[in-house]
Amino acid sequence: AGVFELQIHSFGPGPGPGAPRSPCSARLPCRLFFRVCLKPGLSEEAAESPCALGAALSARGPVYTEQPGAPAPDLPLPDGLLQVPFRDAWPGTFSFIIETWREELGDQIGGPAWSLLARVAGRRRLAAGGPWARDIQRAGAWELRFSYRARCEPPAVGTACTRLCRPRSAPSRCGPGLRPCAPLEDECEAPLVCRAGCSPEHGFCEQPGECRCLEGWTGPLCTVPVSTSSCLSPRGPSSATTGCLVPGPGPCDGNPCANGGSCSETPRSFECTCPRGFYGLRCEVSGVTCADGPCFNGGLCVGGADPDSAYICHCPPGFQGSNCEKRVDRCSLQPCRNGGLCLDLGHALRCRCRAGFAGPRCEHDLDDCAGRACANGGTCVEGGGAHRCSCALGFGGRDCRERADPCAARPCAHGGRCYAHFSGLVCACAPGYMGARCEFPVHPDGASALPAA
């Protein structure tokens, strides 16, 4: 018995062109959660039930609202690990599916709407008890960075968590460095000793004296990242030219891209260009199939006809969405506007409106500007049911009655000094900097590091 642990480090746009738009917006704030599904990695044809090793769902992450005009950043993540307990032996080779789900929190009054943002999958070799293995997977334009490990729960030990060792209450009769092991208390087990020098972070062993490498590492002692440059040994000092004495294996040697993907070297590693219907770091993920168990809430999975729709979920009553992930009730059509709460009274629906709104569907925005004055030339702005003043330059506060200090926010960068001025503010820049906010360094040759047009 033991636990598979998954730590998500980041989920955001991958490198390269075609960065995805943020999945959340000001109108539809959302939060992420993750689902992991584990299967023993026996063979591609193994008719395993979906998630035969187990599955886990993360907590919901923090609510995120897109800043208008900003590129999609790495999105805020749920706290904690995803833990998948396993009862039997750890198989050593396993398949994983990690899904990133979006929970929309806007006007989804009939309960939140869920949609699948990205799904990554892979097959890995992993010994229980080893260190955290790091991985990066891409799904379309998204990139997921994560670490995982398998650890045994006492009294289980070993790379498969199949041996039971218990600490002895009596002083050990075993020699130094040996541990007593159940079932026979007088049987002593030597801790597994890998090949001398085998990297404790990137290598592991299942037999004494061996050194097997985790994903992304190579070399006899698993100390060489797969992404190192093609030069294994530099030329001697007598050589005037730079280059390689013996060309080492390039990252694309042997084509790591599966399913007909084409490999191209990148400064740090390699990149696979995948054919239609495949994705993942090595094009190892085909369009998800019914074997992956993609249908929630008892949906019936039917294989699709083409690679772009590898499955179709037939949802039971009360659920819809491509994965039957959305609960459907009579409030699901969102009859209430402006954030009103939909209530199903049985015979009909009713809307409970937020402050500042009225009407059967909360459609009327109560004019909070009526009879309200904004001082010092400010103008009243309606919206969200709240009265807000847009103040003239130099004034602030709810009713524009406060004189604003434009320097309060310390707007001048790199030690520039701020001076309040009738038209706003002026920055006096420190030597070596220029710009309205002293944001650009001036290079010695006189050119400033202005952003490219």
Partner: antibody, heavy 120, light 107 residues
Framework: EVQLVQSGSELKKPGASVKVSCKAS????????MNWVKQAPGQGLEWMGI????????IYNHKFKGRFALSVDKSSNTAYLQISSLKAEDTAVYYC?????????????WGQGTTVTVSS | DIQMTQSPSSLSASVGDRVTITCHAS??????MGWLQQKPGKAPKGLIY???NLEDGVPSRFSGSGSGADYTLTISSLQPEDFADYYC?????????FGGGTKVEIK
């Protein structure tokens, strides 16, 4: 006077697409959902789906998932039913029917129907 | 999906007769149902909503009753213009479902 006026009959070949329109007048378009109902020759009524014209949110009968799409154009008070990859069994009369969005009423007003014939 | 079982599927009656059509839902629908009338070659027309309420302009000889899963449409005195097909529909839960219809013919 409340009226739902649908587009005219269509004769299409298998594999083609069709877009049926339903123009609403005489009421506030966004205050009522629009239902779409199929009636095959000599058969009863079958509910296809519903759309909220205000938000564009749709719910489909699972039997009509995939090739069928509901949409609206609020500027012209028009609801649409699009059917792609037409099959012979799509031959039917298609009706739009409005329903109060707070479900205080049932499908009270119906369009006159649009006959779609799929034949090679 | 909620099944709506309508009976009879057809009936013959004379002008002035009292006619009753029933509809049984496969689960309770709390009155979220209506009755529709459809004449040959025409669109359906709403008669009753919420099980018992008459739509605007519908003659008072039509009435609806029932609760839970069982509902009845009654025409107290059949008129010549009432010969048509009648359908029940539930809107308690998506997908909405219709009964199979009842054809009311002249005897």
């Amino acid at each position: 006077e409340v009226q739902l006026v649908q587009s005219g009959s269509e004769l299409k070949k298998p594999g083609a697409s069709v877009k049926v329109s339903c123009k609403a007048s005489g009421y506030t378009f966004t205050d009522y959902y629009m239902n779409w109902v199929k009636q095959a020759p000599g058969q009863g009524l079958e509910w296809m789906g519903i759309i909220n014209p205000y938000s564009g949110v749709t719910i489909y009968n699972h039997k009509f998932k995939g090739r069928f799409a509901l949409s609206v154009d609020k500027s012209s008070n028009t609801a649409y039913l699009q059917i792609s990859s037409l099959k012979a069994e799509d031959t039917a009369v298609y009706y739009c029917a409005r329903q109060d969005s707070l479900l205080d009423y049932a499908m009270d007003y119906w369009g006159q129907g649009t006959t779609v014939t799929v034949s090679s | 999906d909620i099944q709506m079982t309508q009976s009879p599927s057809s009936l013959s009656a004379s002008v002035g007769d009292r006619v009753t059509i029933t509809c049984h839902a496969s689960q309770g629908i709390s009155g979220n149902m209506g009755w529709l009338q459809q004449k040959p070659g025409k669109a359906p027309k709403g008669l009753i909503y919420h099980g018992a309420n008459l739509e605007d302009g519908v003659p008072s000889r039509f009435s609806g009753s029932g609760s839970g899963a069982d509902y009845t449409l009654t025409i107290s005195s059949l008129q010549p213009e009432d010969f048509a097909d009648y359908y029940c529909v539930q809107y308690a839960q998506f997908p909405y479902t219709f009964g199979g219809g009842t054809k009311v013919e002249i005897k």
